[in-house]
């Protein structure tokens, strides 16, 4: 049919370029290159119906369904989704093609389904059908990588049993301490499963797929390093493989390394050695202790000894199930607006946790730092002095942990007033929670010093606003005060704030605001 327009249907995926998680804001949004959805004519359908290729979208992803129409003249359009019509505003691109878009922000189950686009051009009418579904990630898994020795070779294989198939990479660093962070120039990455260079200072293997990234560090005892003040501890679950690397450097080759478990030499087949000369002609030896599948009786002190270095040990603990150990009692803090403060949680966990800090339904990235004593710590400082409840949530394959914090910000009260026919009410934030006084202003008391005590009802912390407690005080109207100005004052240790109200007829009449320091 010559009258049929040339139609192109595309899908644009958006990456939310935002450091915080759980934001409804689409700003700033970065777009991926458009993906062609085909848009073929649907055979045996009444009317002209184009069908786009099915679209699978991740939960919370943001997308645009877009149609480009190469047809003369103006076009009008209408989107229909689940029997509701949605506004449609076509525009024209530089090639003078009609462009119609449907933006779906933060994909949810309710936004999945058939999107019908009805287009009317000067020449003809036609329909375009998009089917949008949520990608089934229930079957997806991302497992922490583990190590295996390569058959007949002195090399390690990194394995992660994950769906979809993960990309595996080795992350190597020859520096000490913090400079082995991912973005450091000292870090080298190798996107391969097998690693032959096993002499480095810090060796990790990472696996990543659509669900994220998981890493496992090769546990190492370095006999040339001063031992930690507390014994290093390695946790494993029953059935997991154990790998410990002992490393030593000496001026010549005249030294040997051995592994012992609880003073008994490891059996043949549970260790292997490698050695090399370094650039300055010193000898580096490494001795691996490994158990392909640990049992409870593999628990104990593993000691690496050298004929030329002091020996060092690590405690290996085999557990049936993962754990997160930390105190979950809630903690309350109060600070001034001008002082800095960080929440912190100290915990011991295996396997490594995933964690978030949450405030007011907004989640923030969570950083963890390992301490020398086997504990880890997570700090959150970016509260921007907003009072309320902060939640630390951590989980791993076997355990969950939640800890609540309350942050109170010391500040002078600020009063809001409202009045009705029968009463006047004042509300105040501020911390510590304020106390209230009501005063009547009259000829006798032009400075509003006459205190009102009858008919006053105070409610402390009756509702939470953005995590802030609000205190209120209500004055029931009596004949004695009708027509007068009254003043409600909230005061705490940081100051006083007042609001003056005229009590005559219904309606809100905050009249004058006095702020008394």
């Amino acid at each position: 049919n010559q009258d049929l327009p040339v139609i192109k249907c595309v899908l644009i995926n958006h990456k939310n370029n935002d450091s915080s998680v759980g934001k409804s804001s689409s700003y700033p949004m970065v777009s991926e290159s458009p993906e062609d959805l085909g848009c073929a004519l649907r055979p045996q359908s009444s009317g002209t119906v184009y069908e786009a290729a099915a679209v699978e979208v991740d939960v919370s992803a943001s997308i645009t369904l877009q149609v480009l129409v190469d047809a003369p003249g103006n076009i009008s359009c209408l989107w229909v989704f689940k029997h509701s019509s949605l506004n449609c505003q076509p525009h024209f691109d530089l090639q003078n093609r009609g462009v119609v878009s449907m933006v779906i922000l933060k994909m949810t189950e309710t936004q999945a389904g058939e999107y019908l686009l009805f287009i009317q051009s000067e020449a003809t009418n036609y329909t375009i059908l998009f089917t949008v579904s949520i990608r089934n990630t229930l079957l997806y898994t991302l497992r922490r990588p583990y190590f295996r020795k390569m058959e007949n070779q002195d090399a390690l294989v990194c394995i992660s049993e994950s769906v979809p198939e993960p990309i595996v990479e080795w992350v190597l660093c020859d520096s000490q301490g913090e400079s082995c962070k991912e973005e450091s120039p000292a870090v080298v990455k190798k996107e391969e499963k097998v690693l032959h260079e096993l002499f480095g200072t810090d060796i990790r293997c990472c696996a990543r797929n659509e669900l994220g990234r998981e890493c496992t560090r090769l546990f190492t005892i370095d006999l040339n390093q001063t031992p930690q003040t507390t014994l290093p501890q390695l946790f494993l679950k029953v059935g997991e493989p154990l790998w410990i690397r002992c490393k030593a450097v000496h001026v010549n080759h005249g030294f040997g390394l051995t592994w012992e478990l609880e003073n008994k030499a490891l059996e043949e087949g549970n260790y292997f050695e490698m050695s090399t000369y370094s650039t300055n002609r010193t000898m580096i030896r490494i001795l691996f202790a490994f158990v392909s599948s640990v049992a409870r009786n593999d628990t104990g002190y593993y000691t690496c000894s050298s004929s030329k270095h002091p020996s060092q040990s690590a405690l290996v603990t085999i557990v049936e199930k993962g754990f997160i150990n930390a105190t979950n009692s809630s903690e309350d803090y109060e600070i001034d607006q001008y002082e800095e403060f960080c929440f912190s949680v100290r915990f011991k966990a295996y396997p490594q946790i995933r964690c978030t800090w949450t405030f007011s339904r907004k989640s923030f990235p969570c950083e963890q730092k390992g301490l020398d004593n086997g504990y880890s710590i997570s700090k959150f400082c970016n509260h921007k002095h907003q009072p309320g409840e902060y939640i630390f949530h951590a989980e791993n394959d076997d355990a969950q942990f939640t800890k609540m914090f309350t942050l109170n910000i010391r500040r002078k009260p600020q009063v809001l007033a409202e009045a009705s026919a029968s009463q006047a009410s004042c509300f105040s934030d501020g911390y510590p929670l304020p106390s209230w006084t009501w005063k009547k202003c009259s000829d006798k008391s032009p400075n509003c010093t006459e205190e009102i005590t009858e008919g006053v009802w105070n409610r402390k912390a009756n509702r939470k606003v953005f995590g802030q407690w609000v205190s209120s005080s209500t004055l029931n109207m009596s004949e004695a005060i009708k027509g007068f100005l009254v003043k409600c004052c909230a005061y705490n240790s940081l100051g006083t704030s007042c609001e003056t109200i005229l009590l005559n007829s219904p309606g809100p009449f905050p009249f004058i605001q006095d702020n008394i320091s």
């Epitope: 370029n17 002082e339 960080c342 959150f380 970016n382 921007k384």
Partner: antibody
Framework: EVQLQQSGAELVRPGALVKLSCKGS????????IHWVKQRPEQGLEWIGR????????MYDPKFQGKASITADTSSNTAYLQLSSLTSEDTAVYYC?????????WGQGTLVTVSA | DIVLTQSPASLAVSLGQRATISCRAS??????????MNWFQQKPGQSPKLLIY???NQGSGVPARFSGSGSGTDFSLNIHPMEEDDTAMYFC?????????FGGGTKLEIK
């Protein structure tokens, strides 16, 4: 990648005012405090003040009160520092910095030269 | 305001040796168990770079030869072994309370 991009150098007359900008990329400024710091030639660093762009609450070092005014525009992900009644004492490099968990990210600085 | 006194004002150290810079606060910079003392490095024509935060935590991509220590009011930055690239100005800074204050700076050079 987190970046703070500051506006270019300014040459201004005494008594005038100047407005410097600091545009965030790779993060949303609403989620962080944005601070401004002054550094006079060959001298140390002085904290001017900060803004919470989410609610426009500002805090200043008293010695910059009246001299500096910090604002933010969340739609363009940009913070601003306005300096008024400029004198030669205001000749300096002005930095913006983002505070989340400490002062990790800084802008490249804007040199303001006050000269007749 | 919390006043930070940094010493020495300038320091020359041989390559491979240890450089130690001290910073004393006029009052404690501790709050609920965290000391809000940070260290910055600044090279000519560049903006300051966070080296150490909260006394002893290394900033992103900072080499392990930079370490911090101290508590309460007395803090120090150690650089060992000293390298060519470490020639710069170093500032301590407290973020315990507003106004945030900086030390006067230490100019570190190669001997």
């Amino acid at each position: 990648e987190v970046q703070l991009q500051q506006s270019g150098a300014e040459l201004v007359r005494p008594g005038a005012l100047v407005k410097l900008s600091c545009k965030g990329s790779g993060f949303n400024i609403k989620d962080y405090y944005i601070h401004w710091v002054k550094q006079r030639p060959e001298q140390g660093l002085e904290w001017i003040g900060r803004i919470d762009p989410e609610n426009d609450i500002t805090m200043y070092d008293p010695k910059f009160q009246g001299k500096a005014s910090i604002t933010a525009d969340t739609s363009s992900n940009t913070a601003y520092l306005q300096l008024s009644s400029l004198t030669s004492e205001d000749t300096a490099v002005y930095y913006c910095a983002r505070n989340g968990n400490f002062f990790a990210y800084w802008g490249q600085g804007t040199l303001v030269t006050v000269s007749a | 305001d919390i006043v930070l006194t940094q010493s020495p004002a300038s320091l020359a150290v041989s390559l491979g040796q240890r450089a130690t810079i001290s910073c004393r606060a006029s009052e404690s910079v501790d709050n609920y168990g965290i000391s809000f003392m940070n260290w910055f490095q600044q090279k000519p024509g560049q903006s300051p770079k966070l080296l150490i935060y909260a006394v002893s935590n290394q900033g992103s991509g900072v080499p392990a030869r930079f370490s911090g220590s101290g508590s309460g009011t007395d803090f120090s930055l150690n650089i060992h072994p000293m390298e060519e690239d470490d020639t710069a100005m170093y500032f301590c800074q407290q973020s315990k309370e507003v106004p945030w204050t900086f030390g006067g700076g230490t100019k570190l050079e190669i001997k």
